[in-house]
Interface confidence: low
């Protein structure tokens, strides 16, 4: 059987290294060897590249090596396949070397901001040593912020023949680390070089981008002053590297700027003590280059009626997120402030907050919250400078069984009855929402009974017990993950009721 006709011939000129052609089929059923016939020097010369030795037999690739690599030039290539049964020739293919030239990648040696020019990086590189000296090179510059996986690209050409090349990449974010990589090709070529080694550069710092500002209003003190915990953070979209040297705060009662107070701090939180009136608070961050735009907050008067527009709220878990959704009766409200913090018996150590716009839901990755912790989540509607009544819910991202069961005691022991009371498990030990309690009780050497009650019940009267009998009892608290038993207690029912005994005694 004759070999298959060689097809899909593809040739590439590795500049000053070799001229290589490949074809299909890559493997024949029987031993096949190939000849690649080339004409070069614009058709004046011809030669053959052969794969007939044992190392290259049956291998659908062949390379022509210097010194017969002529450039610029047009080559024709024809592949002959031969086996014991005969020869099969490919069609003749035509190759312009400029169109199939592949060169080495360039080498970036500097990615720097230029003093005084904002949001720009200047990339400097060395042209590949092995590249045609006079040819125009086209380039693709890929860049991304250091913590992003998404590459952006810009294409340009360079005609000059200096080995050191420069490109100014503009419209970047201020004070942000960027990763750069560059590839090149002769302008007419269809083959790009590989990508250069990645290099990192940082754009110049600017005055801070801006702040998000929020507050926690605390109950008024005995002397009438209101503690207000102010908190702020870099605005969404601010450069990751942005650092503030400090923050200036000023505040005054509404319509009375004469009473302006100012504070300077390096913290991102500050407690103010305000009177009962409406106050306006302003915060800016600053660094060595200037100040951010002003963040403004209105603190309502103590007796001000706040609007209410959230009607319902649900928290649900997906595989890796906690999603909170709410319904509102006010279509004009499109900004919301979400607060979340652990529901602990002491003052919460971590308090978080985030603004939501143009949505009525908020999502957080589960791994940003601690498993087995209950979180209080509140959503405030914000309409211009007014903050409405919050709607709150609680959520766990993962429930576990309680780390301790309820502490239980037996009261009012009678002949056939007993009242069992138990204490709520401390918040830190619940590990989930307590959905019910189960009372397990058993007479000595007798059958075990159980009674399950709702989580809001902390006392239960057991009846139909046997008189003058020892019982053991424990209460189990259950979450969705399972239950944990409290301490076991023992009691003995009376032989005769106290009431009956006293009555008898008086007669």
């Amino acid at each position: 059987v004759l070999p298959a006709k060689p097809e899909n011939i593809s040739c590439i000129f590795y500049y000053e290294e070799n001229f290589t052609c490949t074809w299909s089929p890559e493997k024949e059923a029987s031993y096949t060897w190939y000849k690649v016939k080339r004409t070069y020097s614009y058709g004046y010369k011809s030669d053959i590249c052969s794969t007939d030795n044992s190392t290259r037999g049956n291998h659908a690739s062949c390379s022509f090596l210097p010194p017969t690599i002529t450039n610029p030039d047009n080559y024709t290539i024809q592949v002959e396949a031969q086996n014991a049964d005969g020869i099969m020739k490919s069609d003749i293919t035509y190759w312009n070397l400029d169109a199939i030239m592949k060169i080495e990648p360039p080498e970036i040696f500097s990615v720097k901001s230029v003093l005084g020019i904002k949001r720009m990086l200047q990339i400097k590189w060395i042209r590949p040593v092995l590249a045609p000296h006079s040819s125009t090179l086209k380039y693709t510059l890929r860049f991304r912020t250091i913590n992003s996986a998404y590459w952006m690209e810009v294409n340009f050409t360079k005609e000059d023949i200096d080995r050191d090349e420069t490109y100014n990449l503009t419209e970047l974010q201020a004070f942000t680390e960027y990763v750069m990589t560059l590839r090149c090709a002769p302008a007419e070529s269809m083959f790009w070089s590989g990508w250069s080694q990645e290099k990192v550069g940082t754009t110049e710092e600017e005055a801070p981008y801006g702040l998000d500002l929020w507050r926690v209003l605390k109950p008024a003190m005995v002397d009438g002053r209101r503690p207000v915990q102010l908190m702020w953070k870099k605005a969404t979209g601010a450069p990751v590297l942005e650092k503030a040297l400090g923050y200036n705060i000023w505040y005054f009662p509404e319509n009375n700027t004469n009473l302006t107070e100012t504070v300077n701090t390096t913290n991102q939180t500050h407690e103010l003590y305000l009177g009962g009136k409406t106050y306006w608070v302003y915060v800016v961050s600053y660094n060595s280059l200037g100040e951010s735009p002003v963040a403004t907050l209105r603190i309502p008067a103590l007796n001000e009626k706040t609007f209410q527009c959230i009607e319902a709220m649900q928290a649900c878990l997906t595989q890796d997120q906690l999603v909170v959704e709410w319904q509102s009766s006010a279509p004009e409200v499109d900004t919301w402030m979400v607060e979340w913090f652990p529901d602990v018996d002491s003052e919460p150590s971590s308090f978080s907050w985030e603004s939501v716009s143009q949505a009525r839901n908020w999502t957080i990755q589960k791994d940003e919250l601690k498993p087995l912790w209950c979180y209080n989540i509140s959503v405030y509607p914000v309409l211009r400078d007014r903050v409405g009544q919050p709607y709150s819910t609680q959520a766990y991202v993962q429930e576990g069984i309680p780390s301790a069961g309820p502490v239980t005691q037996a009261d009012s022991i009678g002949v056939k009855t007993v009242t069992i009371t138990w204490k709520e498990i401390p918040k830190s030990k619940r590990n989930g929402f307590i959905k019910n309690y189960t009372i397990f009780y058993q007479a000595e050497d007798g059958k075990e009974f159980s009674k399950t009650v709702n989580s809001n019940i902390l006392q239960y009267r057991l009846e139909s017990l046997t008189r003058r009998t020892s019982y053991s009892l424990q209460v189990m608290a259950s979450t969705n993950a399972g239950g944990t038993n409290g301490t076991k207690i023992n009691f003995k029912t009376l032989s005769i009721s106290h009431h009956h005994h006293h009555h008898h005694h008086h007669h």
Epitope: F109, S110, K112, V200, E205, V240, L241, K243, A244, L245, T266, N267, Q268, N287, S288, L289
Partner: antibody
Framework: EVQLVQSGAEVKKPGASVKVSCTAS????????IHWVRQAPGAGLDWIGR????????KYAPKFQGRATLTADTSTNTAYMQLSSLRAGDIAVYYC????????????WGQGTLVTVSS | DIVMTQTPLSLSVSPGETASISCKAS??????VTWFRQKPGQSPQLLIY???NRYTGVPDRFSGSGSGTDFTLRISTVEADDTGVYYC?????????FGQGTKLEIK
Amino acid sequence: EVQLVQSGAEVKKPGASVKVSCTASGFNIKNTFIHWVRQAPGAGLDWIGRIDPANGNTKYAPKFQGRATLTADTSTNTAYMQLSSLRAGDIAVYYCARYYYVSSYFDVWGQGTLVTVSS
Amino acid sequence: DIVMTQTPLSLSVSPGETASISCKASQSVTNDVTWFRQKPGQSPQLLIYSASNRYTGVPDRFSGSGSGTDFTLRISTVEADDTGVYYCQQDYSSPWTFGQGTKLEIK
């Protein structure tokens, strides 16, 4: 007063780990980077890496990557440097230093913590 | 990694004279060079940042110059208290690297 106070000297066995603390006073570590540098006896200074306490981002010198771990607890204004798989070549004084990104220099250094590795 | 090479490694100067320490980077570090002094048993102290800016409280006898790959620290009218080891350091690219140190001795 602005200062960095480091934990006391440590003696460890080869293969063990050491954790050095660096507590800041007079400033908030969230507004700076904390760098760690070591100095072997009679030798020069060797940069280990840095942490941005505001977000926990770290950068390490290649020779310490995988063995050094930098962490920070902003609630206590403290940075930590842990070095694992200790060997005799790790005997050194370990320094923490504050670096303000906007002014670009180490202006405050800890007093240093001597780590000795001995079987 | 960028290598910072200091010369000389030790220097002995009489009070009142000028001491000069050179620092050469293996590639351009623009002006991202800092100079420190370390006295025996103490932590390093900042002297010069961004190649030529004197840190607050540093006497004007100390001056830094240079850019690209060649940097110099000059101490004019040397005093007895200037004794110690002087280090240059680059923060142009990670990992940040220090020179080997120059020991200055006052005769």
